[in-house]
Interface confidence: medium
C-alpha cells in the first residue's frame, strides 16, 4: 500500500478526514462478537480482552456482558450511521478503499489473534454491500505490523 | 519523531501572539495535531485541532473565535494564531501529535516541550 | 469527573483511578501521566490498549461512562498526575487529574 501522499487524491483524504467512521467501527466489532458468541465460546480470556470490563468483582460494568452492546437496536443504529457515512464514498470507489483501510488500521491493535482478524477483514469487505453501495474491486486490507503507527 | 513548539512569549490583553510547532520524524500529512494548554498549577485543557490536510478544525469553546489553527504540510509546521488575547490564556502550550489522520480518535502519542504564554499589562 | 483528586500511596500498592462521564462516550477515552515540568504522555488509549513502551502493570478498563486506569504495583518512577481524556466528541475534554504523592 503506497503512502497517503504518493497517492495524489487530496480530495479524497480530506473527505476522510470529515467522515466519521467510528460507527462502522462499533457496529463490526459488535457483529464479530455476536458472531463469537452464537459459536458457544469466549474468544478471550480476561486478561486479553481489551474491551473487558473492570477485572474487579466489585465493580460491575453496566454495559456487560460485553462493552459493545450486543443487542440488536445498537448495532442496527451503528450500522445506519455507517451506511450514511460509506454512501459519501459511493462516487469514489478508490476513496472507498482508503476507508475500508482505515477503518482496518484503527482497529487493528484491537483484534485479538489471526482468526479474529481475519473475520474482521470479512465482514469488512462485506461492509459496503451490506449498506447497498458497491464495493471496491480490489482493496488491500492487510495492514503492516505497527498498524497506525508505521508511518 | 519530534516536535517543537516556538512563539511563546509576553502578550498584551487584547492583543494577538502567533505559536509555531515544527514537527520531524514522521510524514506530516499522515496525522492531525492537537495544541494542548496547561495554566500554572493546573490541568491540561485541550485547545484545538487539525486535521492532516487540514481540511478539518476543531476547537474548544473557550478560544473559539479568538484562535485559529493553521497548517503548512510543504513546511511540516502548524501554527495556532492568538488573537484578542485574555488574562485567563496564560499557560504552556503543547503541540501534541495524533495516532490518525482524523483528529483525536485514538490519543496523542508525541507532544513538544511546551511554550510558555503570559498575558499580562 | 475524574476521582480522587490525589492520593498518598506506597511502592508495591494497587492503585485505582476512575473516570466518570455524564453521558456514554463508548471506549474513546485515553490515559496520560504528567510528571512535573514535563510533557503528559499517553498511556492506554480506547480505553484499555496500553501503548507500546508502557509497562504493564497498567490498565484501564470500562465502557459507555465509567472508566478505570489500575496500576497494579505502583514503582517509584509512577509518582506524577494522571488525566483521562474524552475523545467522544468535540470539545475533548480533560479530567481534572489525579495526583499520586508518595505516603
Known amino acids: 500500500r503506497q503512502q497517503w501522499e504518493l497517492q495524489g487524491d487530496r480530495r479524497c483524504q480530506s473527505q476522510l478526514e470529515r467522515a466519521n467512521l467510528r460507527p462502522c467501527e462499533q457496529h463490526l466489532m459488535q457483529k464479530i462478537q455476536r458472531d463469537e458468541d452464537s459459536y458457544g465460546r469466549d474468544p478471550y480470556s480476561p486478561s486479553q480482552d481489551p474491551y473487558s470490563p473492570s477485572q474487579d468483582p466489585d465493580r460491575r460494568d453496566p454495559y456487560s456482558p460485553s462493552p459493545y452492546d450486543r443487542r440488536g437496536a445498537g448495532s442496527s443504529q451503528h450500522q445506519e450511521r455507517c451506511c450514511n457515512e460509506l454512501n459519501e464514498f459511493e462516487n469514489n470507489q478508490r476513496c472507498m478503499c482508503e476507508a475500508l483501510q482505515q477503518i482496518m488500521e484503527n482497529q487493528s491493535d484491537r483484534l485479538q489473534g489471526r482468526q479474529q482478524e481475519q473475520q474482521f477483514k470479512r465482514e469488512l469487505r462485506n461492509l459496503p454491500q451490506q449498506c447497498g453501495l458497491r464495493a471496491p474491486q480490489r482493496c488491500d486490507l492487510e495492514v503492516e505490523s505497527g498498524g497506525r503507527d508505521r508511518y | 519523531v519530534q516536535l517543537v513548539e516556538s512563539g511563546g512569549t509576553l502578550g498584551q490583553p487584547g492583543g494577538s501572539l502567533r505559536l509555531s510547532c515544527t514537527a520531524s520524524g514522521f510524514t506530516f500529512n499522515r496525522f492531525a495535531i492537537n495544541w494542548v494548554r496547561q495554566a500554572p498549577g493546573k490541568g491540561l485543557e485541550w485547545v484545538a485541532a487539525?486535521?492532516?490536510?487540514?481540511?478539518?478544525?476543531y476547537y474548544a469553546d473557550s478560544v473559539e473565535g479568538r484562535f485559529s489553527i493553521s497548517r503548512e504540510n510543504s513546511n511540516n509546521t502548524v501554527f495556532l494564531e492568538m488573537n484578542n488575547l485574555r488574562g485567563e490564556d496564560t499557560a504552556v502550550y503543547f503541540c501534541a501529535k495524533d495516532r490518525t489522520p482524523v483528529t483525536n480518535y485514538y490519543g496523542m502519542d508525541v507532544w513538544g516541550q511546551g511554550t510558555t504564554v503570559t498575558v499580562s499589562s | 469527573t475524574q476521582s480522587p483528586s490525589s492520593l498518598s500511596a506506597s511502592v508495591g500498592d494497587r492503585v485505582i483511578i476512575t473516570c466518570r462521564g455524564s453521558q456514554t462516550i463508548d471506549n474513546y477515552l485515553n490515559w496520560y501521566q504528567q510528571k512535573p515540568g514535563k510533557a503528559p504522555r499517553l498511556l492506554i488509549s480506547?480505553?484499555?490498549s496500553l501503548q507500546g513502551g508502557v509497562p504493564s502493570r497498567f490498565s484501564g478498563s470500562g465502557y459507555g461512562t465509567d472508566f478505570t486506569l489500575t496500576i497494579s504495583s505502583l514503582q517509584p518512577e509512577d509518582f506524577a498526575t494522571y488525566y483521562c481524556q474524552q475523545t467522544s466528541s468535540t470539545p475533548y475534554t480533560f479530567g481534572q487529574g489525579t495526583k499520586v504523592e508518595i505516603k
Open positions: 480506547a480505553a484499555s
Open positions: 487539525i486535521s492532516g490536510t487540514g481540511a478539518v478544525t
